[in-house]
Interface confidence: low
């Protein structure tokens, strides 16, 4: 039989309304102020809270924390850190708080933190170290099994003087702590390219969301070991024809399901390996729906729908006839 | 030294009430939930109740629900076991036991209980 | 509820000798990190006493001769070399979900 609660399955210092107690462990301690906590169900929410930094009270049976829509702007080294550690939380989303530094250390002694969210935070400073913790070549591994970093560019003019897609990813590859990832998810941040080494050392990824960025080429970026990558979301970036080398790479990886729609395909002679491949391939969702956008007289002409005659490319002319 | 003292028992006639009380000291009774688990004669335990440590949330076993309430005080450090409506079967040893922070860890610490007998 | 059923229902064994108890759960009380299953012993006259959490945790205080093992449904308290201060009653109990339950008891004499 499910428990019987006399207060609400939410415990709240503000008024809140719950569904019912399900059936599940009682779960003691208090809930910090501005806070909604369910013992039964091990979640605690400070949602749109204006809170200026975490809780230092946060219950120790916390397996779900939500610390969204707040005004957090820096998470120091320990931001988690309890006595006796939070060792359940395993969920932790931070999205739409405005953090703009995320510093080493700052998950650390989280020994269950399987998901965290990051989205949604303009991060001008994301320290190499803050999923690993330490500045040692090779760190302990990091217990996270999905990552949620979609739209964290900071505005152009908060930015430090360095390229942001390096910043990240020297995030993701420090100390090789994040060899047990997942699901990576990177949509919405101007990424106008992919580092070469990223994905060779996340080796077990699932799930990668790389949608409504600004990638251009995918030429130097390898695939070949992901073996078990199962998505790959490519939609709406700048992506203009994929190589022989990414065709074969992406054929080869046995589970793979790509989703390219509104890249603004170019559709000359360089397209014309993409469009075989594409036209025996079964990798790639919704490939009826992909359409030239250049050149001029052939946008949004279907890139299944063409044939090698179509795809031509004007000549080069010499250099003394060029013009700008 | 974490004790747990509990007192209030005694002998009570069918239908009558009994408030039981634990009284706790060694350790911040805040920040800990507390339950009342009880034995009856010759028997093996069976758990009766639940308090947070804030008195957010209550928990009852289905044989003593609508009629027993288990309430706290902070500030007394003391538990409570409201008692209404009693029948024979309730009679029994009534332990108050501490749950930790971590609700993997069992009860930790528990008194040495008090005598409720329900007879006519 | 869930169920634990708890065997057997008494145990004589010689002293310095080993004793095992067994607890079986209706349903799993685990998850992929713990086991909420505890074991107490209860001396005559006295409360229970908490001896292991989380299926194979010794608490504090506890003698090193009482080990737990298992997960899911199936849990055992091992008593490796039987003392005379050791005869009691053992019971086993989960806090996977309300209400907790223990099992039955097993009374540990010296045979």
């Known amino acids: 039989s499910s428990p019987t609660s006399s207060a609400s399955s939410f415990s709240s210092s503000a008024p809140f309304l719950a569904s019912a107690v399900s059936a599940q462990p009682p779960l003691p301690d208090q809930c910090p102020a501005l806070c909604e906590c369910s013992e039964a169900a091990r979640t605690v929410k400070c949602v749109n809270r204006n809170l200026t930094e975490v809780p230092t009270d946060l219950p120790a049976y916390v397996r779900n924390l939500f610390l969204t829509g707040n005004q957090l702007a820096v998470l120091p080294a320990g931001a988690f850190a309890r006595r006796p550690p939070l060792a359940e939380l395993a969920a932790l989303n931070l999205s739409g708080s405005r953090l703009d530094e995320v510093r080493a250390g700052a998950f650390e002694h989280l020994p269950s933190l399987r998901q965290l969210d990051l989205s949604h935070n303009p991060l001008a400073d994301l320290s190499p170290f803050a999923f690993s913790g330490s500045n040692a070549s090779v760190s302990a591994p990091s217990p996270l099994v999905e990552l949620i970093l979609n739209h964290i560019v900071p505005p152009e003019d908060e930015r430090q003087n360095r390229s942001f897609e390096g910043m990240v990813v020297a995030a993701l590859l420090a100390g090789r702590a994040l060899q047990g990832l997942r699901r990576l998810e990177l949509a919405s941040n101007h990424f106008l390219y992919l580092p070469r080494d990223v994905l060779a050392q996340l080796p077990s990824l699932r799930h990668l969301d790389l949608s409504n960025n600004s990638l251009v080429s995918l030429t130097y970026v390898s695939f070949r070991n992901l073996t078990h990558l199962e998505s790959l979301h490519l939609e709406d970036n700048a992506l203009k024809v994929l190589h022989n080398g990414t065709l074969a790479e992406l054929q080869g990886l046995p589970h793979i399901r790509v989703f390219l729609d509104n890249n603004p395909w170019v559709c000359d002679c360089h397209m014309a390996d993409m469009v075989t491949w594409l036209k025996e391939t079964e990798v790639v969702q919704g490939k009826d729906r992909l359409t030239c956008a250049y050149p001029e007289k052939m946008r949004n002409r279907v890139l299944l729908e063409l044939n090698s005659a179509d795809l031509d490319c004007d000549p080069i002319l010499p250099p003394s006839l060029q013009t700008s | 030294e974490v004790q747990l003292v509990e007192s209030g028992g005694g002998v009570v006639q069918p239908g009558r009430s009994l408030r039981l009380s634990c009284a706790a000291s060694g350790f911040t009774f805040s920040n800990f939930g507390m339950h009342w688990v009880r034995q009856a004669p010759g028997k093996g335990l069976e758990w009766v109740a639940y308090?947070?440590?804030?008195?957010?949330?209550?928990y009852y076993a289905d044989s003593v629900k609508g009629r027993f309430t288990i309430s706290r005080d902070n500030s007394k450090n003391t538990l409570y076991l409201q008692m209404n409506s009693l029948r024979a079967e309730d009679t029994a040893v009534y332990y108050c036991a501490r749950s930790p922070a971590y609700y993997r860890y069992g009860l930790d610490y528990w008194g040495q209980g008090t005598t409720v007998t329900v007879s006519s | 509820d869930i169920v634990m059923t708890q065997s057997p229902d008494s145990l004589a064994v010689s002293l310095g000798e080993r004793a095992t108890i067994n607890c079986r759960a209706s349903?799993?009380?685990?998850?992929?990190?713990?086991?909420?299953m505890h074991w107490y012993q209860q001396k005559p006259g006295q409360p229970p006493k908490l001896l292991i959490y989380?299926?194979?945790n010794l608490e504090s205080g506890v003698p090193d001769r009482f080990s737990g093992s298992g997960s899911g449904t199936d849990f055992t308290l091992t008593i490796s070399s039987l003392q005379a201060e050791d005869v009691a009653v053992y019971y086993c109990q989960h806090s996977w979900e309300i209400p907790y339950t223990f099992g039955g008891g097993t009374k540990v004499e010296i045979k």
């Open positions: 989380s299926s194979s």
């Open positions: 308090i947070s440590s804030g008195s957010s949330t209550f």
């Open positions: 349903q799993s009380v685990s998850s992929s990190t713990f086991s909420y």
